[in-house]
Structures are given as structure tokens and as C-alpha cells.
């Protein structure tokens, strides 16, 4: 008789999840020699231990603490780039501007980027059929709790000027319900962070509006100011040119506004 299995609303665990996490860990240590002390088998064991045999709607930040400890990493606190709804451009930027870091440029972020995972209460099985959806099922699921945990720690580590890339093509350029709006903004430390600088990325070729005047940006400014952190905002009218100018700053066309 087939065993009854909870059917969740979200997609199941990414195929080859254990192999992918382990391979990514080794790749990360190959790319970043300063992380060669990391034991990737232990990292996978700690990752697995955070959600295996646990109800996938009852995961806590505490469950991830062994993994957080193993993945401890020092990134330059004044070189942090946060992003919201514009991951690809943020990653293209840090690929060129090698001294800046998104969360996915750290070991733990790199391990989990674009993956889904969950287990089942009281069995050691990984659920490849379905996992809880944040809205339709529960917020304390393995994926959401992981990103909340690592995002909080990442924001807490930031200092001096923190940059955030925002998607100017969205109806809510700043969304209070995004990970940036609900976690990172509230965990920047006013005693360490002097300024949050928002880069609003324009989508349209002919879009010359000042999106820094958008009501949601004003809302972000208000939240940040109330936390005793200065706020500044820049329009990035031409993201393609912006990246090109980061690559080749001496290019003559890079003196004009981008």
C-alpha cells in the first residue's frame, strides 16, 4: 500500500539536490582559496540536518545554526550589495566589480541559490514531489527560513555605505514584503551603517523619469531615516551601459549619466 504523503502547493526538492549542494561547496572552495578549510561533507551533513525528519512547516532559524557556523565567512563589510527582484543584474555587477559581494557570492548563498528543498516529519526522505509554498502553505518552510536566516546575518554584517539594487520596472520598486524589505532593511546596524544607497534600475530604453521620486522609494527613505541611517538614491537609466562602464571606466562615453 503506497504511504500517504503530504501534498504541498509548491514545487518539490530540486533534483540532484544533495549532489548539487556538495558539488557547489567544493566548487566554491576551488574558486575561493581562502575557504579551503571548509569540510564540504560536514557542510552537507549540517544542511541536511536542518530539515530532514522535520515537519516542513515547523523549521526554525535554530535548525540552521550548525550550518551557519560551518559557513562562517568574512566579507568586507563596506562592499555589500543587496538586491530586490533584480538578481541577475546584481550578479553580473559583482562578476565585474570583483571586490563587491551579494549574498549569493558568499558560500551559503552560493550553495542554495535557485534551489528548493524540504523533508518530511519522522522520515529521513527528501520530498521531491512538493514543498510548502510561502503564501499558500506556510512561511516557516525550509527554504524561506534559510533565506531569512542568511539574509539577516548578511545585513547585520554590513557597514559604512551599503548599496541596494532595485528593479525600476516593477509596480512596487521597493516592496516591504520582499526579503530586502522585510529582513535586510531592518537588520542593518545603525551604529555601523552610515548610508544606504539605492540604485534604481530602469527597464525601458526611453525611460527618463526620476524613479527616485517613486512613492515606494520615499517609503524606503522614511524607514531608513527612522533607523538613523542616511539614504541616497541614483537612477541607472541604462543598465547595459552601466555594466560596460564598470568594466571599462576609462571609456569616454562613461562620463555622462548612465
Amino acid at each position: 500500500v503506497p504511504r500517504w504523503r503530504q501534498q504541498w502547493s509548491g514545487p518539490g526538492t530540486t533534483k540532484r539536490f544533495p549532489e548539487t549542494v556538495l558539488a557547489r561547496c567544493v566548487k566554491y572552495t576551488e574558486i575561493h582559496p581562502e575557504m579551503r578549510h571548509v569540510d564540504c561533507q560536514s557542510v552537507w551533513d549540517a544542511f541536511k540536518g536542518a530539515f530532514i525528519s522535520k515537519h516542513p512547516c515547523n523549521i526554525t532559524e535554530e535548525d540552521y545554526q550548525p550550518l551557519m557556523k560551518l559557513g562562517t565567512q568574512t566579507v568586507p563589510c563596506n562592499k555589500i550589495l543587496l538586491w530586490s527582484r533584480i538578481k541577475d543584474l546584481a550578479h553580473q555587477f559583482t562578476q565585474v566589480q570583483r571586490d563587491m559581494f551579494t549574498l549569493e557570492d558568499t558560500l551559503l548563498g552560493y550553495l542554495a541559490d535557485d534551489l528548493t528543498w524540504c523533508g518530511e516529519f519522522n522520515t529521513s526522505k527528501i520530498n521531491y514531489q512538493s514543498c510548502p509554498d510561502w503564501r499558500k502553505d506556510c512561511s516557516n518552510n525550509p527554504v524561506s527560513v534559510f533565506w531569512k536566516t542568511v539574509s539577516r546575518r548578511f545585513a547585520e554584517a554590513a557597514c559604512d555605505v551599503v548599496h541596494v539594487m532595485l528593479n525600476g520596472s516593477r509596480s512596487k520598486i521597493f516592496d516591504k514584503n520582499s526579503t530586502f524589505g522585510s529582513v535586510e532593511v531592518h537588520n542593518l546596524q545603525p551604529e555601523k551603517v552610515q548610508t544606504l544607497e539605492a540604485w534604481v534600475i530602469h527597464g525601458g530604453r526611453e525611460d527618463s523619469r526620476d524613479l527616485c521620486q517613486d512613492p515606494t522609494i520615499k517609503e524606503l527613505e522614511s524607514i531608513i531615516s527612522k533607523r538613523n541611517i542616511q539614504f541616497s538614491c541614483k537612477n541607472i537609466y541604462r543598465p547595459d551601459k552601466f555594466l560596460q562602464c564598470v568594466k571599462n571606466p576609462e571609456d569616454s562615453s562613461c562620463t555622462s549619466e548612465i
Epitope: 548539487t20 558539488a23 567544493v26 566548487k27 576551488e30 574558486i31 582559496p33 562578476q95
Partner: antibody
């Protein structure tokens, strides 16, 4: 069985661009970093750069920076190395190589090499 | 960049001899060193990784030792198929670098 199979020999004129392919089989392409190594005739080995095929992230040796582009096509499990503004000193055998994850970060697997001759 | 200096550059020896090749690093690379064998027209073959671990399928007459800045590759009893060029490589830091090579010839 892990295999890295490179494209055939090329003859190019100075100033031209060459693009060499490295098709892999026997493992999951995105699970490993791919490196490229140059060996000029009668000379030693020189590391050129790496790519993470999963994300397309790259890093290049300063000597080749600006002239080399490493790419990966995950739909065909193929890595590419493109070298532009060719000069006679670029005449060499080019290898793709990867580690085994169990052998430190030494290159346990190599392509057979591609000879590029730059001559006017 | 980390410089690796191999010595000697050329070495003549006979079948059955014990030979030692040295690789000196310009800074501490811990045990992050590999040794390769290369024959004419062929790709290099990994012999030793992590300074002293034997790669799969490599005969036990090959051994590596050392850490920090001084490393050696030893072939305990030369076989005819061992006449080739040997390279050390550091993977402690990017850019990865190789020694200039040691050509082992039949005396």
C-alpha cells in the same frame, strides 16, 4: 568515464580571434570548475583562467585579461576558450582541464589539447 | 604571483635509478601542490596531489613530500616509461602557477 574532447588544430593570422571548444562527457558538467592552460612550443604550462559552467562566472590570469573569454554552454556540455588579437607568441597548445574533487585541486582530467598556430 | 622553481631542469638517469626532483615556492603554499608527468604530444598526467597523495592509477614508485616552500618528487626505481618531463603546480592561490619543468632523459 570522464572525457574532455577538444576541437581540432587551427591556423590563424595575427590580429585574428580563435575559439576552441571542449566537450565533456561522463559527469555532470555544472558540478565542476573548468580551467584552461596554455603550453607554447617547447615551453612550460601556463594557467589562463577558469569558468563555473553553472553560473558562467569566470576568472582570468592577468597576462590574458582583456584578450581571453571563457564561456560554457550547458545545453551541449561544452566549454569554450576564445583568444583575440592573436600574435605569434600565442602559438601554443591549449588544454581544458578539471579537478576530481577527490584530488585536492590538481587537474585530474585533461583534454587532448588543441594546437593554435599564429602565422602571417 | 607565486613562483615555482624546479631543479634540476634536466636530469639524466638509468633504468632502476632512484631520482628526486625539487620544487621550491616563492612563498608558503602549505600542501597545495601537484606533480604532473608529460610525454611529447600528450596532455599532462596528474601523479601527486596535496604534496604527498598518489593519484589514482599511479604506480607506487612515485612519491611526493614536503610542505610550505620545499617539495620533492621521488621515483624510487626508474622504469623505461618514466622518461618524460615533470612539472609541479601550486593551487594555493590564483593565478595557479607551474614550475618550468624537469626533463628526465635516459643516460
Amino acid at each position: 568515464e570522464v572525457q574532455l574532447v577538444q576541437s581540432g588544430a587551427e591556423v590563424k593570422k595575427p590580429g585574428a580571434t580563435v575559439k576552441i571548444s571542449c566537450k565533456v562527457s561522463g559527469y555532470t558538467f555544472t558540478d565542476y570548475i573548468m580551467h584552461w592552460v596554455q603550453q607554447a612550443p617547447g615551453k612550460g604550462l601556463e594557467w589562463m583562467g577558469w569558468i563555473d559552467p553553472e553560473y558562467g562566472r569566470t576568472d582570468y590570469a592577468e597576462k590574458f585579461q582583456g584578450r581571453v573569454t571563457i564561456t560554457a554552454d550547458t545545453s551541449t556540455d561544452t566549454a569554450y576558450m576564445e583568444l583575440s588579437s592573436l600574435r605569434s607568441e600565442d602559438t601554443a597548445v591549449y588544454y581544458c582541464a578539471r579537478s576530481a574533487h577527490t584530488t585536492g585541486f590538481g587537474f585530474a582530467y585533461w583534454g587532448q589539447g588543441t594546437l593554435v598556430t599564429v602565422s602571417s | 604571483d607565486i613562483q615555482l622553481t624546479q631543479s634540476p631542469s634536466f636530469l639524466s638517469a638509468s633504468v632502476g635509478d632512484r631520482v628526486t626532483i625539487t620544487c621550491r615556492a616563492s612563498e608558503d603554499i602549505y600542501s597545495n601542490l601537484a606533480w604532473y608527468q608529460q610525454k611529447p604530444g600528450k596532455a599532462p598526467k596528474l601523479l601527486i596531489y596535496d604534496a604527498n597523495s598518489l593519484a589514482d592509477g599511479v604506480p607506487s614508485r612515485f612519491s611526493g613530500s614536503g610542505s610550505g616552500t620545499e617539495f620533492t618528487l621521488t621515483i624510487s626505481s626508474l622504469q623505461p616509461e618514466d622518461f618524460a618531463t615533470y612539472y609541479c603546480q601550486q593551487y594555493n592561490n590564483y593565478p595557479y602557477t607551474f614550475g618550468q619543468g624537469t626533463k628526465l632523459e635516459i643516460k
